[in-house]
Amino acid sequence: QERRFQLEGPESLTVQEGLCVLVPCRLPTTLPASYYGYGYWFLEGADVPVATNDPDEEVQEETRGRFHLLWDPRRKNCSLSIRDARRRDNAAYFFRLKSKWMKYGYTSSKLSVRVMALTHRPNISIPGTLESGHPSNLTCSVPWVCEQGTPPIFSWMSAAPTSLGPRTTQSSVLTITPRPQDHSTNLTCQVTFPGAGVTMERTIQLNVSYAPQKVAISIFQGNSAAFKILQNTSSLPVLEGQALRLLCDADGNPPAHLSWFQGFPALNATPISNTGVLELPQVGSAEEGDFTCRAQHPLGSLQISLSLFVHWKPEGRAGGV
């Protein structure tokens, strides 16, 4: 003979794969204080329980160690704890109270557990700015993971030089010492939930601050094709009267501030151009000499100089009109 009672709360619960859920259950208020028995949680249509406090009863292999009956008759608690939820746990469950000494038992109403795909993703946090050559601790965290679940496995992927730091159930620390070439490269934290066989990851692009490593000047003279110089150059021949466009380019992140100077400037010299472009509309022989492009950056500066040698074609000058 069975007596029925209604589970309090919702008729269905949702949980994401790999995570935990508590199926609430309160023993019926009509239960006599003298009633003594065991509790069993069953999958609808199954006769082997998924969880029980009966030491003589086997539980389903699939749920062993993951489903637990939280049994506390004094507090009328008969809740079911599910950890490392799997897609196959998607089903309806009910609770049964049986006693060897009483002629009747209690059976609860059904409650559906819906197991959804894991949508949470790991978080990667970076304290402040990543600076070339300086170690920084990156933390990959899964704060939505429940403490009682099987601890996740963290793995990191990056081309930058790294070493593993401490970890907890919910986080892993990676020490990274980035180089200029690591700027804009990917770093991935992958988290695997072994209890459910689910893997999630997050990828970020590294933003590495670094001083300029290379500075170059592209030279556009008259209508001729541009050519590039990558190191200090002496006596670059230019044609008198022609337009000359000097385009300075440097790497560095954030971008270096580029400016042009006449000669070899002191640190506080006034530039002749506050950009990487220096236009000489009409080169004159009086202006041959040195020009310097300086790439200034909070982490260091770099400069490159070129020396103009102005020559002229005898037939080049304009005559009278």
Partner: antibody, heavy 119, light 107 residues
Framework: QIQLVQSGPELKKPGETVKISCKAS????????MSWVKQAPGKGLKWMGW????????TYADDFKGRFAFSLETSATTAYLQINNLKNEDTATYFC????????????WGQGTTLTVSS | DIVMTQSQKFMSTTVGDRVSFTCKAS??????VAWYQQKPGQSPKLLIY???NRYTGVPDRFTGSGSGTDFTLTISNMQSEDLADYFC?????????FGGGTKLEIK
């Protein structure tokens, strides 16, 4: 000291031609380009173009192609602006302005020549 | 063509004031901006080039700033001789264009 001295005011009829001069002194004439800038009465400044004083090659802004001509007399260190087939809307002050060595801005200006076109 | 917009046509001030003129480019011109002063009946005079470099002989109360599309000319301690029209000009790309100008007047 550097000076750009322009010719005096002009009063012309529509259809006529005017030639404005700009005499440069105090620097090497063929080292700096010469620009021309128009300022209509009560209006702002409009760049007309420039002439390379070394090669004599002129460059005109789109609005000043056709009736406008820049020329040089290098030996006299003088630049000229000629406007053909004058129209009423050519009434303005015209400035010659030396092109800076390190960019297309203007470091010295002539005093301006006022052109009035009226029938 | 790049349009240089000086939205204030007139500015009223008193001697000793700090005055700022703004100029907005319709596209990025880097730092290729010059500022000119034109007093009534005179030709323009170069004040600032490369957005922030003071031209030789220009008093240090004149300061230029900005890059990209937004530029400012500031007079930190306005003098009566500063009453004039002020024009910005971009020389980043052809054709080189001027702003419409701002007239500085006494209150």
């Amino acid at each position: 000291q550097i000076q750009l001295v322009q010719s005096g005011p002009e009063l012309k009829k529509p259809g006529e031609t005017v030639k404005i001069s700009c005499k440069a002194s105090g620097y090497t004439f063929t080292t700096y380009g010469m620009s021309w800038v128009k300022q209509a009465p009560g209006k702002g400044l409009k760049w007309m173009g420039w002439i390379n004083t070394y090669s004599g090659v002129p460059t005109y802004a789109d609005d000043f192609k056709g009736r406008f001509a820049f020329s040089l007399e290098t030996s006299a260190t003088t630049a000229y602006l000629q406007i053909n087939n004058l129209k009423n809307e050519d009434t303005a002050t015209y400035f010659c302005a030396r092109l800076a060595y390190f960019g297309y801005y203007f470091d010295f200006w002539g005093q301006g020549t006022t052109l009035t076109v009226s029938s | 063509d790049i349009v240089m917009t000086q939205s204030q046509k007139f500015m009223s001030t008193t001697v000793g004031d700090r005055v700022s003129f703004t100029c907005k480019a319709s596209q990025n011109v880097g730092s290729a901006v010059a500022w000119y002063q034109q007093k009534p009946g005179q030709s323009p005079k170069l004040l600032i080039y490369s957005a922030s470099n003071r031209y030789t002989g220009v008093p240090d109360r004149f300061t230029g700033s900005g890059s990209g599309t937004d530029f400012t000319l500031t007079i930190s301690n306005m003098q009566s001789e500063d009453l004039a029209d002020y024009f910005c000009q971009q020389y980043s790309s052809y054709p080189y264009t001027f702003g419409g100008g701002t007239k500085l007047e006494i209150k």
